[in-house]
């Protein structure tokens, strides 16, 4: 059975290039594409020099001068992505240090909940998005980003941290989700698969996309990441699916062309500043939103996830470069770095648009099972 062709106006149809998104049988997730629910790989860790620093190592974020008017975020710990080996597992390897979360990886002991109890929480990420069940919420207005078009200087740090490739963002990138929900961007990173195997973290009706970008933000209500961890809305992540398209994506090429320089785990390079917003879809008005967690230890909850309806197109060569260039721990390729989807446990995913109404001519108009009571502008 083929999934219905996704139109631009239907959930997750059409990338930034305006292409339609036909999902054929070959795109349906197979068993081996779907990490087991009981032992998923993970995502967002909060590393410092040696992955997760202790609380005393988290720098305080002091406002810069009035004239510059932004918070000093460049040294904050990050929220990053781990890997999913051929047999994805919800296990993190610890070195002999014991209980700290600084040296987890996939495929080893102990189970993540022993590394961080929050990993066994009820409201974890990523999740499977079922547009038919999403609650249309008119109060979810278009996202607004400010300061995301960066000049070439100063250069930015691009790092292979063994779990993902991460770009540290400078101070001054602001994101608004609505009243009382203003954020500053900290970093972005990617999740991907392997040859012929998709590697997005979130899925849509079970469909896994080739890759996914996450832009991680700290609420302006908090000066430090450690203060925000576990607090509702303390962190927010913008997520977008990456798909294969006919043309090279020039924005992504500015990063992908530098991956060979950081092939080795722990290596980093400096790249010129770029238009960060160009890495995201162009439609900021249509998205899904829910409250979840970081997807690696410490798996802290309270993270606001915003998943764009529109996808971003990369060429086949670019997707191959992403999945086939970097190396992770233990002489293993850095591939399949996504966590299995987690149960919603009663959570309702909200949509900024009526996602439950499928524009496919073959689909009967569905009943919207969930609703959002909040009013719009």
């Amino acid at each position: 059975q083929r999934l219905p062709r996704m139109q631009e106006d239907s959930p997750l149809g059409g990338g930034s290039s305006g292409e339609d998104d036909p999902l054929g049988e070959e795109d349906l997730p197979s068993e081996e594409d779907s990490p087991r629910e009981e032992d998923p790989p993970g995502e967002e860790d909060l590393p410092g020099e040696e992955d997760l620093p202790g609380e005393e190592d988290l720098p305080e974020v002091k406002p810069k001068s009035e004239e510059e008017g932004s918070l000093k975020l460049e040294d904050l710990p990050t929220v990053e992505a781990p890997g999913d080996p051929q047999e994805p597992q919800n296990n993190a390897h610890r070195d002999k240090e014991g209980d700290d979360q600084s040296h987890w990886r996939y495929g080893g002991d102990p189970p993540w909940p022993r590394v961080s109890p929050a990993c066994a929480g009820r409201f974890q990420s990523p999740v499977d998005i079922r547009p038919q069940l999403a609650a249309f919420c008119p109060a979810l207005r278009p996202l607004e980003l400010l300061g995301f078009q960066l000049p070439p200087l100063p250069e930015l740090r691009l790092r292979n941290n063994g779990h993902s490739v991460q770009l540290t963002l400078p101070p001054g990138l602001e994101m608004a989700l609505g009243p009382g929900r203003e954020y500053r961007a900290l970093q972005l990173h990617l999740h991907w698969g392997a040859a012929g195997r998709p590697g997005s973290e979130h899925t849509v009706e079970g469909h896994r996309f080739p890759a996914e970008i996450h832009v991680v933000h700290l609420s302006t209500a908090f000066a430090r990441v450690d203060e925000a961890l576990g607090r509702p809305g303390g962190l927010a992540v913008l997520a977008a699916f990456l798909e294969e398209g006919p043309e090279e994506n020039s924005a992504y090429e500015q990063l992908l062309s530098r991956l060979e320089e950081i092939a080795e785990e722990g290596s980093e390079t400096q790249v010129p500043g770029l238009d960060i917003s160009a890495l995201l879809p162009s439609d900021f008005s249509r998205y899904f939103q829910y409250e979840g967690s970081l997807t690696t230890p410490p798996c802290a909850q309270g993270v606001i996830w915003t998943v764009f309806n529109q996808t971003v197109m990369l060429s086949a060569k670019q997707l191959h470069t992403l999945s086939d260039t970097l190396w992770g721990p233990g002489d293993s390729r850095l591939q399949l770095n996504f966590r299995a989807t987690q149960p919603l446990n009663g959570r309702v995913i909200e949509a900024s648009f009526p996602a439950g109404v499928d524009s496919s001519p073959r689909a009967a108009e569905p009943v919207q099972l969930n609703s959002c009571l909040a009013a719009g502008d």
Partner: antibody, heavy 119, light 107 residues
Framework: EVQLVESGGGLVKPGGSLRLSCAAS????????MSWVRQAPGKGLEWVAA????????YYLDTVKGRFTISRDNAKNTLYLQMNSLRAEDTALYYC????????????WGQGTLVTVSS | DIQMTQSPSSLSASVGDRVTITCKAS??????VAWYQQKPGQAPRRLIY???NRYTGVPDRFSGSGSGTDFTLTISSLQAEDLADYYC?????????FGGGTKVEIK
């Protein structure tokens, strides 16, 4: 009803100072970013400065940096613009503007106060 | 700084005409564009935010479109009360910048 009322404009000599005020009412002032925007006589609009909801972060147009200071008193529901080292090219009608709640776009404007810098 | 180039600088049209004003950004501003109307002797009034979203209370003859660098404000059927200056503004990067304005006159 949202109301923004500017005051403090007037005639000042080059190099002089003025302090503009904007009294806000009809909304929870402390929840909103605020801006000052100016319009020279017969000309277009020019954004001057902005301030976040708690007053901790400010932004300025390059040509006023170091001369103008935007501030706010949330207890008094008032926005301020302290203007020092005024120049002839600062002559304009100065508007106070509120930003959409939780966003960066501006949605309400006052009627403006005229600042004239002339010897 | 991001330049917002607005055109035309002025236009004259009859009541009922369709009027289009364009704004071109010097670099990508995604959808962070607002449109304002300023009637003679008055403060600017909000019309559109996020390129295409009409504010509550704004007549539906006003519509906005575009993303990236090219944006359009359309008045589908010009009314006498639409005589005003119209400005686009980007709020994607500091400093926020406005277009030079378009004066709309009624024939």
């Amino acid at each position: 009803e949202v109301q923004l009322v500017e005051s403090g404009g007037g005639l000042v000599k080059p190099g002089g100072s003025l302090r503009l005020s904007c009294a806000a009412s009809g909304f929870t002032f402390s929840n909103y970013y605020m801006s000052w925007v100016r319009q020279a006589p017969g000309k277009g609009l020019e954004w001057v400065a902005a301030i976040n909801s708690d007053g901790g972060i400010t932004y300025y147009l390059d040509t006023v940096k170091g001369r103008f200071t935007i501030s706010r008193d949330n207890a008094k529901n008032t926005l301020y613009l302290q203007m020092n080292s005024l120049r002839a090219e600062d002559t304009a009608l100065y508007y106070c503007a509120r930003h959409r709640s939780g966003y960066f776009s501006m949605d309400y404007w006052g009627q403006g106060t005229l600042v004239t810098v002339s010897s | 700084d991001i330049q917002m180039t607005q055109s035309p600088s002025s236009l004259s049209a009859s009541v009922g005409d369709r009027v289009t004003i364009t704004c071109k950004a010097s670099q990508n501003v995604v959808s962070a564009v607002a449109w304002y109307q300023q009637k003679p002797g008055q403060a600017p009034r909000r019309l559109i935010y996020s390129a295409s979203n009409r504010y509550t209370g704004v007549p539906d003859r006003f519509s906005g479109s575009g993303s990236g660098t090219d944006f359009t404000l359309t008045i589908s059927s010009l009314q006498a009360e639409d005589l005003a200056d119209y400005y686009c503004q980007q709020y994607s990067n500091y400093p926020w910048t406005f277009g030079g304005g378009t004066k709309v006159e009624i024939k």
